[in-house]
Structure formats: structure tokens, C-alpha cells
Amino acid sequence: REPTVQCGSETGPSPEWMLQHDLIPGDLRDLRVEPVTTSVATGDYSILMNVSWVLRADASIRLLKATKICVTGKSNFQSYSCVRCNYTEAFQTQTRPSGGKWTFSYIGFPVELNTVYFIGAHNIPNANMNEDGPSMSVNFTSPGCLDHIMKYKKKCVKAGSLWDPNITACKKNEETVEVNFTTTPLGNRYMALIQHSTIIGFSQVFEPHQKKQTRASVVIPVTGDSEGATVQLTPYFPTCGSDCIRHKGTVVLCPQTGVPFPLDNNKSKPGGWLP
């Protein structure tokens, strides 16, 4: 029978670490990490790490009992967890009978938004105490709410990942800019900033009809030339506070007709907030 892995949590040191080993198995040949999505009962989905590793092909594989993988995550707080993956059989061949190196994977470490992870792996039995054993490590940075997969997570949806404010802005005269955008039921407070190198105008927008999606309009006094300036719209939603996804648009000249601004000149861009 071909070896497979059975993985379980092992946060402390491996028992083998306390034992003296004349020989230890060789190091890993490759270690890779990629995110995978899995459905959860709440109708949402979670992102997990698919950690895969390749064993070096030589006779030292015969000593191999397990591979231990540890993950450290750094964002607002630090996390640390390890799994030990035991091989179910002794290795009878240095490569798979069908060809290629022995490759295994573990899916289970949860991935939080916008977090830097350090993934380390080593074979067991590992080096003796006070000796350096062969190990391998890789970094993995999880994407934020702007990512095409992450944006559908409930946490991201509540932070406005699917909201398109369809910002339009035009220079009415030298002193004012008119900004229009589509509101969202996610919140009722917004901040509109006009930037041209520096902030040349801003306004708080309070939209009381929170349950409905409406088109809001605000006229903002400016202190400099506003044509070509950037409009930044910052929403304030309960789930993300002042760290919600920001959207941008560009100020153009208002047309002379009764239409306040051209609707086809939508420069709305996803902002840079990553919860």
C-alpha cells in the first residue's frame, strides 16, 4: 500500500525531539501554499490553506515518520498553530510507483483577510536537541476584500465589497464641486474628499434613508482648481467603522445643460481598504 498522511494538531515539541537519533531523514524538496475555499453551514465560505510538500527522493525517506507544519500569522494579532502529519506506511520506494516525487498536502489552516503567514515544515524524526535540522519555510500573504474570491465573504460584503457607488463628480464653478453617488443599505454616513495633491475640499454626508438604495448628491466647497481632482468616498459601516472600502472618482467639468454631469464618465475605482 502507498503511504498517505494522517494529520492532527501538535502545538508543542514533537516527542522525537527528546530522543537521540543517529540519522535523520532528508529535508523536504519543495513546500507550497495556496488558498482554497470551502463552504460552511452558515451559507458563507471559509478560506483555508492548501499546504503541499514534496519529499526528497533518496533512501533517507525510509526513516521518515511524519512531517510537521507550523503556521504563524501576523496581522492585528499574532497566531500560531502546528499540525503533525504522520505517514501511514513505511516508504518502500524513493519515488511514487506511478512516477514522480512523493507529494502530500494538508488543507486545514484557516486564512484570515489580509494577513502575512509564515509556514514552516520539517521532517520527523527531526534534529537532536541543540542541532539544526533540515527544514523549509515559505511566506504567504492572504488577499483582502478586493480579491475576486474574498469579496464574496460575508465579512467583506458587510464592509462594502459588492457595493458600487457609481461616483460622478463635476466642477460647477471655481468654488464648488458636485458629487453624486449611489448609497447602500449597509450604512448611512459617508465622507467625500476632493484631492488634488492635497485635500482641497471635503464634506460629511448623512443619508437617513438607510434601508433604501438612493442617489445622493452633495455640493462641496473647494479651495483650489478642482478639474481632474480625485474624489474619495469613504463609507462608515457598522462592521468596519472608518476602515471600510474606499471608492474613487474623478472631477470633470459640469456640462452647461441642465444635466449636472455626464453619467458615462464613471471613474469609480475600488479603494485600498483591506479588512
Epitope: 543517529d22 540519522l23 532528508g26 527522493a57 533518496d58 533512501a59 533517507s60 525510509r62 526513516l63 518502500q92 520506494t93 524513493q94 519515488t95 511514487r96 510507483p97 506511478s98 512516477g99 514522480g100 516525487k101
Partner: antibody, heavy 118, light 107 residues
Framework: EVQLVQSGAEVKKPGASVKVSCKTS????????MNWVRQAPGQGLEWMGR????????QYNQKFKDRATLTRDTSISTAYMELSRLRSDDTAVYYC???????????WGQGTLVTVSS | DIQMTQSPSSLSASVGDRVTITCRTS??????LAWYQQKPGKAPKLLLY???NLGDGVPSRFSGSGSGTDYTLTISSLQPEDFATYYC?????????FGGGTKVEIK
């Protein structure tokens, strides 16, 4: 039945290159590493290197790293060993050898005599 | 690299004799050792692997023992077809190395 059939004897001048082939049959070519071993006249066996036909990973004996090139063609289940900048002391029988488990060599080619002489 | 020291380099024996060849390695190879027999003009033939396991079709008069750094090939009763050169080889990890060989000649 596993068979490894090597190309015929070669006579080369110093500085030239030689390419020896090893055609396999009777097993799945990509499943076993292919090793190359040489034996100078009246001398012992010397491991030159090995190639994994599955992904072309190669490991060399440092002695041959700069002059030996191991390749394979999976479509015809054949491994190759090319040795460049030949010297007279490269005169030897060159063997391909493989095994299904670890690198004990259960199966050998018949050998290819390469003579380097001016 | 692991060094392989094989002894003796040659020996003379008669049919029916018990013959012992030793192989010492420069470091523990955890029984990852093979023995080969080679006759003039022929490719080597695998006799034993993992220090003690007989290769396919190898007569039971051949046996192997040892562990760590010291290994032995024994021919319990030498037959006429056993006159040849014998090599040990480690396969613990590349680079693989062979012993210098032991030539078994007719006394």
C-alpha cells in the same frame, strides 16, 4: 521483463563529446530513476549521476558535474548520457542502471565502450 | 561523500570453501548497502540489497550481514561460477559510491 539496451561502442578523439543512449522496456520508464556508472579498464565502478525521467531532476557526482549531461526522451523510454571535453582517462565502459525501489541497481544495460584516443 | 573500504582486494579459494568479504563505510549508512557480482566483459549483477536481502534468482549460498558501518558478504560454499569480482555499494543518498572490489580467484 525489464531490459536496458545501450548504443554501440564509440571511438573519440580527445576534446570531442560522446552521447550514449539507453533504451528501456518492460517497465514504466518514468517510475524509476536512471543511473549512469562507468568502469575504466581493469578498474572499479564509479557512479556518475542519475536522472528522474518523470521531471528531469538530475543529481551528479561532483566529479562529472561540469562535463556530463543527463537527458531523457519519455516518448521513446530512452535515457542519454553525454560526456564532453573527452580525455584519454575517460576511456571506459559506461553503464545505465536502474531499480524499482531505492538505488540498488537490479537492472543494468550491457555497457557501451567509449575509447578516447588521438 | 561516503567512502567505501572493501577487503580483501583479492583472494584465492577452492570450490566448496566458505568465503567472506567485508565492506566498511565512513559513516552509518543504515543498512542501505548492495552487493554485486561482475564477470569479465559483463555488467554487474545484483546479489543483495538492504545488506541482507537476496536479489531475484540469486542462490541462497550468498548471504549478507552487518549494520552501521560494517557489512559482510558470505558465500557459504563456493561454486565454479562464483569466481568473479564482487563490489559493495551504498545507496544512502547521492553521490553513491562503490567499494574497490574483491577479486575471487581459483586457488
Amino acid at each position: 521483463e525489464v531490459q536496458l539496451v545501450q548504443s554501440g561502442a564509440e571511438v573519440k578523439k580527445p576534446g570531442a563529446s560522446v552521447k550514449v543512449s539507453c533504451k528501456t522496456s518492460g517497465y514504466t520508464f518514468i517510475s524509476y530513476w536512471m543511473n549512469w556508472v562507468r568502469q575504466a579498464p581493469g578498474q572499479g565502478l564509479e557512479w556518475m549521476g542519475r536522472i528522474d525521467p518523470y521531471d528531469s531532476e538530475i543529481q551528479y557526482n561532483q566529479k562529472f558535474k561540469d562535463r556530463a549531461t543527463l537527458t531523457r526522451d519519455t516518448s521513446i523510454s530512452t535515457a542519454y548520457m553525454e560526456l564532453s571535453r573527452l580525455r584519454s582517462d575517460d576511456t571506459a565502459v559506461y553503464y545505465c542502471a536502474t531499480s524499482g525501489g531505492f538505488d540498488w541497481f537490479a537492472y543494468w544495460g550491457q555497457g557501451t565502450l567509449v575509447t578516447v584516443s588521438s | 561523500d561516503i567512502q567505501m573500504t572493501q577487503s580483501p582486494s583479492s583472494l584465492s579459494a577452492s570450490v566448496g570453501d566458505r568465503v567472506t568479504i567485508t565492506c566498511r563505510t565512513s559513516e552509518n549508512i543504515y543498512s542501505n548497502l548492495a552487493w554485486y557480482q561482475q564477470k569479465p566483459g559483463k555488467a554487474p549483477k545484483l546479489l543483495l540489497y538492504d545488506a541482507t536481502n537476496l536479489g531475484d534468482g540469486v542462490p541462497s549460498r550468498f548471504s549478507g550481514s552487518g549494520s552501521g558501518t560494517d557489512y559482510t558478504l558470505t558465500i557459504s560454499s563456493l561454486q565454479p561460477e562464483d569466481f568473479a569480482t564482487y563490489y559493495c555499494q551504498h545507496f544512502w543518498g547521492p553521490p553513491y559510491t562503490f567499494g574497490g572490489g574483491t577479486k575471487v580467484e581459483i586457488k
